[in-house]
């Protein structure tokens, strides 16, 4: 999916609003220097496609992320926000609404979440130059 | 089976506002995104905006914004679109629809439309 | 905003007879388009999403084809329930645009 045409501020603003606060309860008790963030971005659009793909797709040692409330409020945003976006998600499971008990969350996983958080504070600052 | 029902006609006078209901019954509410689409007599579809219930989050068309505002009541499972200083040219049925994936904005399913008429 | 343009603005046609209505997109909307049917006095009803996916319960004779800019939806052999207006809708863009509509009456 292409995100050229997201509206992007309105984005930012369910970031900084809820999506943000999410994503710190998940890592709670977790030290802010525990994890090197290793992926990056480049610009908005880039930012979140990388977001999409941490959030939704699973990797090894952390099968999903999907059912998280951080996953199920940036999944709305986007579908409200990227026109066309949730049509792109159709084969996706419509089983990660039925919320089951929180498994136990790896340190793959915590891991994951932070360099998301990275991503994010990247896609907050479009206009910084890359590291 | 998903329905939408929605509030009766409306003849409303121009500079006034109208607020149209559309209560969602068979199955879940909040994560399936609302959109508003009017037709005005005789001629084509036109969207209005949407929201996702789940969050309150609400797209509006550039050329409703700051005259409509759509919003979702959980717990009666209704949302509601209202558009203020209205003008004749706003006379027109006015549908909600839904989609029938999470926070989609396809639209699946429709409401019966309701008649706006404004006229002094 | 994008336009969407459909051709013809009518068409008549008789039953068994094969229709092709076609819809322009001002500018790349990729397959985000879909179509909608709508009967007088009627809300819209959904038959393709995705430029050429058939929704769920919408009779096999409608088709969609195309990507980019140029589209069609193709009834291979009209029904009399199939007279009614159409409508295309591009998807790839804010705020969400339709065509004007083609009507499709009986000869």
């Known amino acids: 999916y292409d995100f050229t045409n997201c509206d992007f501020e309105k984005i930012k603003a369910a970031y900084l609003s809820t999506i943000s606060k999410d994503l710190i309860t998940y890592m709670s008790g977790t030290k802010s220097t525990e994890f090197n963030n290793t992926v990056s971005c480049s610009n908005r659009p880039h930012c979140l496609t990388e977001i999409q793909s941490l959030t939704f797709n699973p990797t090894a040692g952390c099968a999903s992320l999907a059912k998280e409330m951080f996953a199920m409020k940036t999944k709305a945003a986007l579908a409200i926000w990227c026109p066309g976006y949730s049509e792109t998600q159709i084969n996706a499971t419509q089983a990660m609404k039925k919320r089951r008990k929180r498994k136990v969350t790896t340190n793959k996983c915590l891991e994951q979440v932070s360099q998301l958080q990275g991503l994010w504070r990247r896609f907050n600052r479009p206009l910084l130059k890359q590291q | 089976q998903v329905q939408l029902v929605q509030s009766g006609a409306e003849v409303k006078k121009p500079g006034s506002s109208v607020k149209v209901s559309c209560k969602a019954s068979?199955?879940?509410?909040?994560?399936?995104?609302i959109s508003w689409v009017r037709q005005a007599p005789g001629q084509g579809l036109e969207w209005m905006g949407g929201?996702?219930?789940?969050?309150?989050?609400?797209n509006y068309a550039q050329k409703f914004q700051g005259r409509v505002t759509i919003t979702a009541d959980e717990s009666t499972s209704t949302a509601y679109m209202e558009l203020s200083s209205l003008r004749s040219e706003d006379t027109a049925v006015y549908y909600c629809a839904r989609s029938g994936m999470f926070y989609s904005i396809l639209f699946d399913y429709w409401g019966q439309g309701t008649l706006v008429t404004v006229s002094s | 905003d994008i336009q969407m343009t459909q051709s013809p603005s009518s068409l008549s046609a008789s039953v068994g007879d094969r229709v092709t209505i076609t819809c322009r997109a001002s500018q790349d909307i990729y397959n985000y388009l879909n179509w909608y049917q709508q009967k007088p006095g009627k809300a819209p009803k959904l038959l393709i999403y995705?430029?050429?996916s058939l929704q769920s319960g919408v009779p096999s004779r409608f088709s969609g084809s195309g990507s980019g800019t140029d589209f069609t939806l193709t009834i291979s052999s009209l029904q009399p329930e199939d007279f009614a207006v159409y409508y295309c809708q591009q998807q790839n863009d804010y705020p969400l645009t339709f065509g004007q509509g083609t009507k499709v009456e009986i000869k």
């Open positions: 929201i996702i219930p789940d969050f309150g989050w609400a």
């Open positions: 995705g430029a050429s």
């Open positions: 068979g199955g879940t509410f909040s994560s399936y995104a």
